[in-house]
Interface confidence: low
């Protein structure tokens, strides 16, 4: 008869024996033997392990470096890593959020479709017909052209994606 080749969930195989894994937040000190259980110890301050494991060292919490525009969004525990995010006006350059860049602004002719967050950049969209944006902004959406008719005025100059229409008074001679 052969020793086991696989162990149950939350166990690992060593020396033909199934040993308990250490729970999240704890590291392995010594494997189990025929006579003793697996020995685990809690991770230290600023360390974590987020899975059932047989790691002999805990991982260091991520450092949110303010020089890179980072700040702590969620403090790490013995079972979770620190989550970083970016300072106001900045967003992460990657999913791991290791550094930040300034939110991009949408140029004239483009409006903000989605305002940037700590983890995503501004999403711009071209202003469709009937809308315009005349500024470079990270917040401004495309604005609709002014409706001259509602002001009892007429269009004197057509609008573009970068400029509003220009309204003027009605031509009285045409009455």
């Amino acid at each position: 008869p052969e020793p086991p080749t696989a162990c149950r969930e939350k166990q690992y195989l060593i020396n033909s024996q199934c040993c308990s894994l250490c729970q999240p937040g704890q590291k392995l000190v010594s494997d189990c033997t025929e006579f003793t259980e697996t020995e685990c110890l809690p991770c230290g301050e600023s360390e974590f392990l987020d899975t059932w494991n047989r790691e002999t060292h805990c991982h260091q919490h991520k450092y949110c470096d303010p020089n890179l525009g980072l700040r702590v969004q969620q403090k790490g525990t013995s079972e979770t890593d620190t989550i970083c995010t970016c300072e106001e006006g900045w967003h992460c350059t990657s999913e791991a959020c290791e550094s930040c860049v300034l939110h991009r602004s949408c140029s004239p002719g483009f409006g903000v479709k989605q305002i940037a967050t700590g983890v995503s950049d501004t999403i711009c969209e071209p202003c469709p017909v009937g809308f315009f944006s005349n500024v470079s902004s990270a917040f401004e959406k495309c604005h609709p052209w002014t409706s001259c008719e509602t002001k009892d005025l007429v269009v004197q100059q057509a609008g573009t994606n970068k400029t509003d229409v220009v309204c003027g008074p009605q031509d009285r001679l045409r009455a």
Epitope: P1, E2, P3, P4, C7, R8, K10, Q11, N15, S16, Q17, C18, C19, S20, C22, V29, C32, T33, E34, F35, T36, E37, T38, E39, C40, L41
Partner: antibody, heavy 124, light 112 residues
Framework: EVQLVQSGGGVVQPGRSLRLSCAAS????????MHWVRQVPGKGLEWVSV????????YHAESVKGRFTISRDNSKNILYLQMNSLRPEDTAVYYC?????????????????WGQGTTVTVSS | DIQLTQSPLSLPVTPGEPASISCRSS???????????LDWYLQKPGQSPQLLIY???NRASGVPDRFSGSGSGTDFTLKISRVEAEDVGVYFC?????????FGQGTKVEIK
């Protein structure tokens, strides 16, 4: 069926030797540590010895150290207790027992299977 | 060696009534992994011992749920919620923290 069948007991004179056997069946014998426990008739249980699954590690109680030797033959699925220089105080029922481990969530789960016991009487 | 002291040593019981046995250790059986290395065994008349409880509170396979184990450190208890006639015998606690393993003196449970 998981089973431990013991043999080798009997009446022996002080100073003589005896070898107990414990034949395992119904489980992967080579994966389990094994123990010997004894019981003086009408008295409590006394732990005697343990051997690791591969036979490399052995421990004996102080009362039998240097006289008793635990061993195993994984190819035959048999556990042994070689008892030398027997004394009247070794008179007891001897049990072999399996240390529950491999398939359980915990790597220790008690002495979960016991043999039927074999009687050793040391008397002149 | 670790010493285990059981009480009472004799326990007359009435079928259907609860019963409780104590086991006290000379040192803590709580290991650094958070588990208490104490087992309970029952030896019925003329039979080999059988495992009831391991690691203080885990019921062994096939053991009726009227048996339960509790405690931590040095004080442990085996409870039978409603004693049945087949529960008679000698109950032993055993520490599995250290080699040599050691047993309590045993508690004899008999029907009144």
């Amino acid at each position: 069926e998981v089973q431990l069948v013991q043999s080798g007991g009997g009446v022996v004179q002080p100073g003589r030797s005896l070898r107990l056997s414990c034949a395992a069946s119904g489980f992967s014998f080579s994966s389990y540590a094994m123990h010997w426990v004894r019981q003086v008739p009408g008295k409590g249980l006394e732990w005697v010895s343990v051997i690791s699954y591969d036979g490399d590690n052995k421990y004996h109680a102080e009362s039998v150290k240097g006289r008793f030797t635990i061993s195993r033959d994984n190819s035959k699925n048999i556990l042994y207790l070689q008892m030398n220089s027997l004394r009247p105080e070794d008179t007891a029922v001897y049990y072999c027992a399996r240390r529950g481990t491999v398939t359980n969530y915990y790597s220790y789960s008690g002495l979960d299977v016991w043999g039927q016991g074999t009687t050793v009487t040391v008397s002149s | 060696d670790i010493q285990l002291t059981q009480s009472p040593l004799s326990l007359p019981v009435t079928p259907g009534e609860p019963a409780s046995i104590s086991c006290r250790s000379s040192q803590s059986l709580l290991y650094s992994n958070g588990k208490n290395y104490l087992d309970w065994y029952l030896q019925k008349p003329g039979q080999s011992p059988q495992l009831l409880i391991y690691l203080a509170s885990n019921r062994a396979s096939g053991v009726p749920d009227r048996f339960s184990g509790s405690g931590s450190g040095t004080d442990f208890t085996l409870k039978i919620s409603r004693v049945e006639a087949e529960d008679v015998g000698v109950y032993f606690c055993m520490q599995a923290l250290q080699t040599p393993r050691t047993f309590g003196q045993g508690t004899k449970v008999e029907i009144k």
